[in-house]
Interface confidence: low
């Protein structure tokens, strides 16, 4: 008889899930010699203490914890970028700019990119058939909640000049629903962070109004400037071009306005 | 360092089944898949399927799909093969192998390593 | 399923010769695959995974080469106990498959 199982409304569990996490431990400890330290059999306990058998609406940033501890990462704390709706174009663009930071590229980021999880209370399964969704079921699930904390914890390890990169092609550049806009916005430290700087990427080729006045990258600019942080925008035109200066500084034609 | 340890050779008459054991020691059990493959006398290897004991997924080859049921202990880190409705073809060496992944630079791999040291299964009436 | 096909199927060679063993596989398996040793009564050795990475505590003579559908086992140097049985296997796709095997005797 199979037995009954709670049916969420989001896809389950990423296919392969241990495998891929660990791998993705191993091939990360091993191309970032800092990180070599770390024992990936560990890490993987811990995430996956982290959340089987518990209940998938009842989780907690405690739950994290011991996997928090275990993948801290000291990345210079000026060199991050922070993302909101536009990942592709973020990770490219840190690839090419080896010194500069997504979550993505810190291990535990690097880990869940993309991967969804969730198990199921007082049982030791890994539930691949559903997971909460944070809408229709609830934001406390085990995905939700890792996302949160690794990122309030990317957001108070900036300083100085911290960079955001922000889709202008979305009706909402800056969504105060996001997880840059309800999470790190609000734990940006005042105290070490000077500027946040708004990169916004622009969609179309011919789009050349100046999306820096738009009524939501105001609203970031009220929410940051109240934390006594300074904000700076800047219109990225042309994305394609941007990388391509970023890869060829000293082309002649990345000396203009990108 | 991890060991493979199979259970011993076994005579079994066509039409019965047989249920071979690999039991893990040294290591990590449940994360990694155990593989069976199995080797007729003077012939190749022959990879029969897998189980990923920390989430009870199993993958069979084709040829042996409704004949062979794998399955593993977590408690006492031992994975088993049962093949059935035996014929004299079956005769052969049955290995358990475990995968695991290693690393380079660029990629990862995965890995047969280590193998048990056989179990000899012969079928005969 | 994916069909590795090896040749030769035996290869004749004098201690401190070069032997050069191929594998062949019906669809491309980009670079996962391993070539395993076996020696009679003994289960299979890896020896390559990633088409050219050697396992732990393989000796130096033993590299592998190529990616796709075409690779290559080579043996630089001949010694007494490289005479054994060898065999590809590719996992990239399920059902991992391994090819029929290469004897190395010797000549």
């Known amino acids: 008889v199979p037995r009954w199982r709670q049916q969420w409304s989001g896809p389950g569990t990423t296919k392969r899930f241990p495998e891929t996490v660990l791998a993705r431990c191993v091939k990360y400890t091993e191309i970032h010699p800092e990180m070599r330290h770390v024992d990936c059999q560990s890490v993987w306990d811990a995430f996956k203490g982290a959340f089987i058998s518990k209940h998938p609406c009842n989780i907690t940033e405690e739950d994290y914890q011991p996997l928090m501890k275990l993948g801290t990462q000291t990345v210079p704390c000026n060199k991050i970028l922070l993302w909101s709706r536009i990942k592709d174009l973020a990770h490219q663009f840190t690839q090419v700019q080896r010194d500069m930071f997504t979550l993505e590229d810190t291990l535990l980021g690097y880990l869940a990119d993309d991967l969804t999880w969730c198990g199921e209370f007082n049982t030791s399964k890994i539930n691949y058939q559903s997971c909460p969704d944070w809408r229709k079921d609830c934001s406390n699930n085990p995905v939700s909640v890792f996302w949160k904390t690794v990122s309030r914890r990317f957001a108070e390890a900036a300083c100085d000049v911290v960079h955001v990169m922000l889709n202008g092609s979305r009706s909402k550049i800056f969504d105060k629903n996001s997880t840059f806009g309800s999470v790190e916005v609000h734990n940006l430290q005042p105290e070490k962070v000077q500027t946040l700087e708004a990169w916004v990427i622009h969609g179309g080729r011919e789009d050349s109004r100046d999306l820096c006045q738009d009524p939501t990258i105001k609203e970031l600019e009220s929410i940051i400037s109240k934390r006594n942080i300074q904000f700076s925008c800047k219109n990225i035109y042309r994305p394609d071009k941007f990388l391509q200066c970023v890869k060829n500084p000293e082309d002649s034609s990345c000396t203009s306005e990108i | 360092q991890v060991q493979l340890v199979q259970s011993g050779a076994e005579v079994k008459k066509p039409g019965s089944s047989v249920k071979v054991s690999c039991k893990a020691s040294g290591g990590q059990f449940s994360f990694y898949a155990i593989n069976w493959v199995r080797q007729a006398p003077g012939q190749g290897l022959e990879w029969m399927g897998e189980?990923?004991?920390?989430?009870?997924?199993?993958h069979y080859a084709q040829k042996f799909q409704g004949r062979v049921t794998i399955t593993a202990d977590e408690s006492t880190s031992t994975a088993y093969m049962e093949l059935s409705s035996l014929r004299s073809e079956d005769t052969a060496v049955y290995y358990c192998a475990r995968w695991s992944y290693t690393y380079g630079i660029r990629y990862y791999y995965k890995l047969f390593d280590p193998w048990g040291q056989g179990t000899l299964v012969t079928v005969s009436s | 399923e994916i069909v590795m096909t090896q040749s030769p199927a035996t290869l004749s060679v004098s201690p401190g010769e070069r032997a050069t063993l191929s594998c062949r596989a019906s669809q491309s398996v980009s670079s996962n695959l391993a070539w395993y040793q076996q020696k009679p009564g003994q289960a299979p050795r890896l020896l390559i995974y990633?088409?050219?990475t050697r396992a732990t505590g393989i000796p130096a003579r033993f590299s592998g080469s190529g990616s796709g559908t075409e690779f290559t086992l080579t043996i630089s140097s001949l010694q007494s106990e490289d005479f054994a049985v060898y065999y590809c296997q590719q996992y990239n796709n399920w059902p991992w498959t391994f090819g029929q095997g290469t004897k190395v005797e010797i000549k």
């Open positions: 189980i990923i004991p920390d989430y009870g997924v199993t």
């Open positions: 990633g088409a050219s």
